[in-house]
């Protein structure tokens, strides 16, 4: 109620002889500041005097503090809030009640605090969780209801008298609510800790023993087992006997059931602590353990690896990789169940031993076609040699080998023949599926690997084929060697280099571009008449009569070829000039007379000149001289001259006779 002073402090404080007491304390006076404070030991109220009697351990007044007990007791408080006290050292006879007599200007109060001082340091108290299970972390707590600033202490944990490695966390409390020192230890107990003694030891600052508390650990755990085997190395041969014994070295609580496991699977009808295996087979090889259960759970022994030894079983071969491409690498693995593992291997290729290969793996760095076939192996260990298994097939794939182009025709081949070629090869894996031909042409392939060339050209020189599976292999080109008649026959003038003039020396050459076979004959002809059989036709002195159309022929064993007709042109000056007269060489006066200058010339006459009987040139320059009307005085001998680019020619005299007409004669 409102008439009380309000105090907060621990109800009882604990200490021991020679230690100290620190009393945390707070208060609130009813009015004003504290004016007087007396600390009594076991105070008793005297009704007669209305005062408290008892030993005064500390006293303070308005006048100041009165020394008491050589300052063993200290008031560490103040006049309105703090009432903390310290007694150092504390003695056995300090046990009892401490009375804090507080007076303010108008109010008084007696606050009681219990002090329990023992003769010797009292033990701490270990607190354990209700159940401890192996491998589950627990916190062990050691609590001591003591703490004092003037008297440092430490709490140490021991397991079977040996300091524990785990780090403990120590905490102290010196508050108005509680005074204690506490050590907490986090700890994962193992089954082997069961029944072991844990101690919390109280020590002074120098590590001197003051007191302790001990507890015995009750660690719940699955059964702990030991397995024993005969023979001890657990290595036996087929037909031998094996005994395994399971021993429980610890179980908390007691075990309830027993079973045996092989490779993690429970063995039926095996529920005793002894497992007898009679006449073992290789299938009984494996990892054995016993399992014993209690309320915590099942416990398993360590595994015993039972090895039933036997000679290698028939082997199998694994190939990486088949089919293999020629030139690639291949690895073979010999697989054979055996115990102990095989120490030696013998490898076979198509039944023949592969020299130098005695390991489990064989590596062929570059596969060749002949490496194809069956690979088998035999494994060997200390107990014997296995049998050769069925083996594995290595398929070696490679491009077609030794490809050739073969001409099926009888030789020689002539231009225009039908040629048949075949593409042959020695071997191929996989099989050849198609063929290619070079050069490409509009040729027919009547069947796979056969090429038919209809009407073969003279210029079909070489043909090559390829046989193809996954790859194409080309044959060397084969020469068709097509035979044909001479080609491109033509006449070529060798000399003279310029135009041919009558009298020149002239040579004509019969040319051709090619011929197969090379041996040829030549023929020259003019107007169907054979002139010569050489490649050249020569004229020592050409005459206009030699002009005309010439052809040459070239023939070989296949046929003959003619050139185009070649015109030989001979240039010459006008010749064979004569004057012809029309209507005749006798003409009546008054009529018309035409004189024509006829000639033979190449090129034709370009210019004519007329002359009379006096060799006088007449003013006429065309081929014809027309006299109209003709007069008697025109009578006489005439001649003409013709000119071309080569030269001139003149005609002989031709006489024109003009006679009088009857009229003239009549007039006369």
């Amino acid at each position: 109620d409102s008439s009380k002073w309000v105090f907060e402090h621990p109800e009882t404080l604990y200490a021991w002889e020679g230690a100290c007491v620190w009393i945390p304390c707070t208060y609130r006076a009813l009015d004003g500041d504290l004016e007087s404070f007396i600390l009594f030991h076991n105070p008793e109220y005297n009704k007669n005097t209305s005062k408290f009697d008892g030993t005064r351990l500390y006293e303070s007044t308005k006048d100041g503090k009165v020394p008491s007990e050589q300052k063993r007791v200290q008031f560490l408080g103040d006049k309105n809030k703090n009432c903390t006290l310290s007694i150092h050292p504390v003695h056995l006879n300090d046990s009892g009640q401490l009375g804090l007599r507080m007076e303010s200007k108008t109010e008084k109060w007696m606050e009681r605090i219990h002090l329990n001082v023992s003769e010797r340091p009292f033990p701490p108290h270990i607190q354990l969780p209700p159940e401890i299970q192996e491998s589950q972390e627990v916190t062990l707590t050691c609590l001591l209801n003591f703490s004092c600033y003037g008297y440092p202490i430490q709490l140490q944990w021991l397991l079977e008298g040996v300091p524990m490695r785990q780090a403990a966390v120590t905490s102290t409390s010196l508050t108005i609510k509680s005074v204690f020192t506490r050590s907490e230890l986090k700890f994962s107990p193992q089954w082997s800790h069961h029944g072991k003694i844990v101690t919390c030891q109280l020590q002074d600052a120098d590590g001197k023993f003051l007191s302790n508390d001990t507890v015995q650990l009750n660690v719940k755990h699955t059964p702990k087992l030991e397995i024993k085997v005969t023979p001890s190395d657990a290595i036996v041969r087929e037909g031998d006997s094996v005994t395994m014994t399971c021993e429980v070295s610890s179980s908390n609580p007691e075990y309830t059931t027993v079973s045996w496991l092989k490779d993690g699977t429970s063995l039926k009808k095996q529920n005793t602590f002894t497992l007898n295996l009679r006449e073992v087979t290789k299938d009984q090889s494996g990892k054995y353990c016993c399992q014993v259960s209690n309320d915590v759970g099942p416990g398993r022994s360590e595994e015993v690896f039972l090895q039933v030894q036997y000679a290698p079983e028939p082997s199998t071969v694994q190939i990486l990789h088949s089919p293999a491409v020629e030139g690639s690498q291949v690895e073979f693995l010999c697989m054979s169940l055996a115990n102990p593992l095989p120490t030696n291997y013998t490898w076979y290729h198509n039944g023949k031993e592969m020299q130098g290969r005695t390991e489990e793996k064989v590596h062929i760095p570059k596969i060749l076609p002949w490496h194809a076939g069956t690979y088998s192996c035999v494994a060997e260990n200390i107990l014997g040699t296995g049998q050769r298994g069925p083996g594995a097939e290595l398929d070696v794939q490679y491009p077609p080998k030794k490809v050739t182009t073969v001409i099926q025709n009888p030789m020689p081949i002539r231009e225009g023949d039908t040629v048949t070629l075949s593409c042959n090869y020695n071997s191929s894996n996989p099989s050849v599926t198609r063929y290619e031909w070079k050069p490409h042409g509009a040729w027919e392939e009547p069947s796979l690997g056969v090429l038919k060339i209809q009407n073969v050209g003279w210029d079909n020189t070489t043909i090559a084929c390829a046989a193809c599976n996954s790859w194409c292999s080309w044959a060397s080109p084969v020469a068709l060697n097509v035979q044909y008649a001479p080609r491109d026959v033509r006449v070529r003038k060798i000399k003279p280099l310029s135009e041919i003039h009558s009298g020149n020396s002239v040579s004509l050459q019969c040319d051709f571009s090619s011929s197969h076979p090379k041996e040829v004959q030549f023929f020259w002809e003019k107007n169907g008449r054979l002139l010569g059989k050489e490649s050249q036709l020569n004229f020592d002195s050409i005459s206009p009569e030699d002009a005309g159309s010439y052809s040459c022929w070239v023939n070989n064993s296949i046929g003959q070829t003619a050139s185009k007709a070649w015109t030989l042109e001979v240039l010459y000056a006008p010749r064979r000039l004569r004057v012809s007269m029309s209507p005749g060489d006798q003409v009546m006066e008054g009529k018309s007379a035409t004189l024509t200058c006829e000639s033979d010339a190449n090129p034709p006459v370009s210019h004519y000149t007329w002359f009379d009987w006096n060799n006088q040139s007449l003013p006429y320059h065309s081929q014809k001289l027309r006299l109209e009307p003709v007069k008697v005085q025109h009578s006489g001998a005439y001649w003409c001259q013709g000119t071309n680019s080569v030269g001139k020619g003149r005609s002989p005299l031709s006489t024109l006779t003009v006679y009088y007409s009857p009229e003239t004669i009549g007039r006369r």
Epitope: Q355, G356, V362, H363, P365, W370, H371
Partner: antibody
Framework: QVTLRESGPALVKTTQTLTLTCTFS??????????VSWIRQPPGKALEWLAL???????YYSTSLKTRLTISKDTSKSQVVLTMTSMDPVDTATYYC??????????????WGQGTLVTVSS | DIQMTQSPSSLSASVGDRVTITCRAS??????LNWYQQKPGKAPKLLIY???SLQSGVPSRFSGSGSGTEFTLTISSLQPEDIATYCC?????????FGQGTRLEIK
């Protein structure tokens, strides 16, 4: 029958490049499974494998000398050439070429040349 | 690289003696081991290939055995013409390597 013959300079100077030719007969290096190798032997010392070339023109070299060696073949001439750069007096040795039988691998050296002594002078 | 170690490095024996030379590989080489004989000033000659196969033309007194890492060359009855240096060679992996050689002489 199979024969191999080494040819090259008897004397080379330090830092020069050595070129050796192995001329062989009785087999073709274009035939699958045929290989030629070079081996050397310093005076009074052990044989040391140098290089190998096979029918496929695959080449293999000694780990310690691979930066200095080049092996090549001329199938038409039935020759294998080895060049070795940066010659040093420690390279003085008899140089052999040998045919390798490739059966299931580069298995053994069945024919050897008579060897050619190369002296490296400083 | 695979190291090949021969022992002994030299040995002396009498005509008719049984002679054994050992070759040890630094790692397993299956049976890909060959033995060569080299006489002074001559090229090596193949005696045994694939650890135990006798090369044609080689006298039958020469034999080879072993696999994995330990190999042996045996001359059953030493003859005067057998005086030479013998060396082993592995072809299991490249680089191909030779042993340092064993010099055999007559007592």
């Amino acid at each position: 029958q199979v024969t191999l013959r080494e040819s090259g300079p008897a004397l080379v100077k330090t830092t020069q490049t050595l070129t050796l030719t192995c001329t062989f007969s009785g087999f073709s290096l274009s035939t699958s499974g045929m290989c030629v190798s070079w081996i050397r032997q310093p005076p009074g010392k052990a044989l040391e494998w140098l290089a190998l070339i096979d029918w496929d023109d695959d080449k293999y070299y000694s780990t310690s000398l691979k930066t200095r060696l080049t092996i090549s073949k001329d199938t038409s001439k039935s020759q294998v050439v080895l060049t070795m750069t940066s010659m040093d007096p420690v390279d003085t040795a008899t140089y052999y070429c040998a045919r390798i039988r490739y059966i299931y691998g580069y298995d053994y050296f069945d024919y050897w040349g008579q060897g050619t002594l190369v002296t490296v002078s400083s | 690289d695979i190291q090949m170690t021969q022992s002994p490095s030299s040995l002396s024996a009498s005509v008719g003696d049984r002679v054994t030379i050992t070759c040890r590989a630094s790692q397993r080489i299956s049976s890909q081991l060959n033995w060569y004989q080299q006489k002074p000033g001559k090229a090596p000659k193949l005696l045994i290939y694939a650890a135990s196969s006798l090369q044609s033309g080689v006298p039958s007194r020469f034999s080879g055995s072993g696999s994995g890492t330990e190999f042996t060359l045996t001359i059953s009855s030493l003859q005067p013409e057998d005086i030479a240096t013998y060396c082993c060679q592995q072809t299991y992996s490249k680089p191909i390597t030779f042993g340092q050689g064993t010099r055999l002489e007559i007592k």
